[in-house]
């Protein structure tokens, strides 16, 4: 059989080999497509199927406007002038070229050593679905799941059956000072069909800046707490990516897993002391916060005057 590729919406003519070019003709066209469940034999006199597949006077079959449901097999059986039976067999596939792909929500710049979303490549109106590929400086980018991450989504329009593809690229640039160019291309995967390319985007890669300072927040404010109360210490850092945070009490590291939050539940006098957090940034080393003092006192002890709220933010009543 012969493989035929037809563009959606375009006419397609399939010739019936061996059929005399003019009536009288002995021929039979049958099809098995998305419009049928099994083989459908077309009436030479024409009928309701003529809108999708009509036998022409020369014996050829005309599909006036091919659609997705016309994908399938078409067969003609004809008797030639010498009485010999000749068969034609066609496997029809359809395609639709989408609009030019676009990179939406592109990044304005990238930061070295951290994950950066470059942008999302979108292609609308393809059939079959096809594929989106990313290119860096003209070379194909192969996602490795680490430095190069691609998140893909394919949706099909419920009425037209055409596909929309989305591909989100995230990269971790190794060094700053470079100006990589990213582009995206769509390919249908059909022979003799060139890929469609987006306009390229060139981005500056900057070195990650040092953290802009580190703050240690304490709750309750002032660090004064009654026995059995809870203290929450939060290490606030404006660095990307978030660094690892370790905790120090009275100058000694606490043997805890790294976390930007330190929770002290049901505090006792043994929890009193001076606390600080240390943020370790991959490219800038450790940075310690100013210390805060935690004091555990009985209600009223050394507290502010009766019924008032002191600077510590802790209200006490006699």
């Amino acid at each position: 059989g012969q493989n035929i590729t037809a563009r959606i919406g375009e006419p397609l003519v399939l010739s019936c080999k061996g059929a005399p070019k003019k009536p009288p003709q002995q021929l039979e066209w049958k099809l098995n497509t998305g419009r049928t469940e099994a083989w459908k034999v077309l009436s030479p006199q024409g009928g309701p199927w003529d809108s999708v597949a009509r036998i022409l006077p020369n014996g050829s079959l005309l599909l006036p406007a091919t659609g997705i449901v016309d994908e399938g097999t078409f067969r003609c059986r004809a008797t030639n002038r010498r009485g010999k039976e000749v068969k034609s067999n066609y496997r029809v596939r359809v395609y639709q070229i989408p609009g030019k792909p676009e990179i939406v929500d592109p990044a304005s710049e990238l930061t070295a050593s951290v994950p950066n979303k470059v942008g999302t490549c979108v292609s609308e109106g393809s059939y079959p679905a096809g594929t989106l590929s990313w290119h860096l400086d003209g070379k194909l980018l192969i996602p490795d799941g680490k430095e190069t991450l691609v998140k893909e989504e394919t949706r099909r329009h419920p009425e037209t059956g055409l596909f929309t593809l989305r591909s989100e690229l995230t990269v971790i640039p190794t060094q700053g000072g470079t100006h990589p160019t990213f582009s995206c291309s769509f390919s249908l995967g059909l022979p003799r069909r060139r890929p469609l390319n987006t306009a390229p985007i060139q981005l500056r890669v900057r070195e990650p800046g040092p953290p802009e300072g580190i703050q240690l927040l304490v709750e309750p404010e002032g660090g004064i707490v009654a026995p059995g109360g809870t203290v929450t210490l939060t290490c606030a850092i404006s660095a990307q990516p978030p660094p690892q945070v370790h905790w120090i009490k009275d100058g000694a590291p606490l043997p805890l897993a790294p976390s930007p939050v330190l929770l002290l539940p049901e505090v006792g006098h043994e929890d009193e002391g001076t606390y600080s957090c240390v943020a370790t940034h991959p490219s800038h080393g450790p940075q310690e916060s100013p210390p805060v003092s935690i004091r555990v006192t009985e209600t009223g002890d050394e507290g502010p005057a009766e019924g008032s709220v002191g600077e510590s933010g802790l209200g006490t009543l006699a």
Partner: antibody, heavy 119, light 107 residues
Framework: EVQLVESGGELVQPGGSLRLSCAAS????????MTWVRQAPGKGLEWVAS????????YYPDSVKDRFTISRDNAKNSLYLQMNSLRAEDTAVYYC????????????WGQGTLVTVSS | DIQMTQSPSSLSASVGDKVTITCRAS??????VNWFQQKPGKAPRRLIY???NLADGVPSRFSGSRSGTDFTLTISSLQPEDFATYYC?????????FGGGTKVEIK
């Protein structure tokens, strides 16, 4: 809103002729096949004629072939049925319907026009 | 020519009843069958297209099914406005053929 309005039905003598019209609105007329269906008094529905969207191809059952001619004017969004050599058995309400091919069947119908063939 | 044999030709039912109407095609017509409802003095209205699909604006109590060349229209719970005549149509081959109709009357 799709609308189909038939006109031209009247009393006619056997052997006479009549031309029915159907004015279409609310859709892209030249995208659809169009059809005439009739219903004799107290009887069921009977297909009379269909025409493809371009008007190049027409289809009839044996009961009206060579007597009736379906045509269309896409510029005027109008469908016609020319009926010649009318017989008493052609007495019916004639409906204009959108469709007639495998993509649609018939999805919208007009209200019909009555043709009476009697002497 | 294809024959569409519709049964029953008439039936009496009460509001709330489940009603089933069948059309049998004399040869394979694929799923190219429509169902119509017609009230006296009115034009037919399409209920079901391509054997099983509910047309726009048609209540969900109507449904269509197919088994080979047998096509069924079901009204799950008959309503007062459903008393009418129902027709099937095959549109797979010319001549296009309607079933003879089923008149649904109040019991």
């Amino acid at each position: 809103e799709v609308q189909l309005v038939e006109s031209g039905g009247e009393l006619v003598q056997p052997g006479g002729s009549l031309r029915l019209s159907c004015a279409a609105s609310g859709f892209t007329f030249n995208n659809y096949w169009m059809t005439w269906v009739r219903q004799a008094p107290g009887k069921g529905l009977e297909w009379v004629a269909s025409i493809d969207n371009s008007g190049d191809n027409t289809y009839y059952p044996d009961s009206v072939k060579d007597r009736f001619t379906i045509s269309r004017d896409n510029a005027k969004n109008s469908l016609y049925l020319q009926m010649n050599s009318l017989r008493a058995e052609d007495t019916a309400v004639y409906y204009c319907a959108r469709g007639g091919d495998i993509t649609t069947g018939f999805d919208y119908w007009g209200q019909g026009t009555l043709v009476t063939v009697s002497s | 020519d294809i024959q569409m044999t519709q049964s029953p030709s008439s039936l009496s039912a009460s509001v709330g009843d489940k009603v089933t109407i069948t059309c049998r095609a004399s040869q394979d017509v694929g799923f190219y069958v429509n169902w119509f409802q017609q009230k006296p003095g009115k034009a037919p209205r399409r209920l079901i297209y391509r054997a099983t699909n509910l047309a726009d604006g048609v209540p969900s109590r109507f449904s269509g099914s197919r088994s080979g060349t047998d096509f069924t229209l079901t009204i799950s719970s008959l309503q007062p406005e459903d008393f009418a005549t129902y027709y099937c149509l095959e549109f797979d081959e010319h001549p296009l053929t309607f079933g003879g109709g089923t008149k649904v009357e109040i019991k």
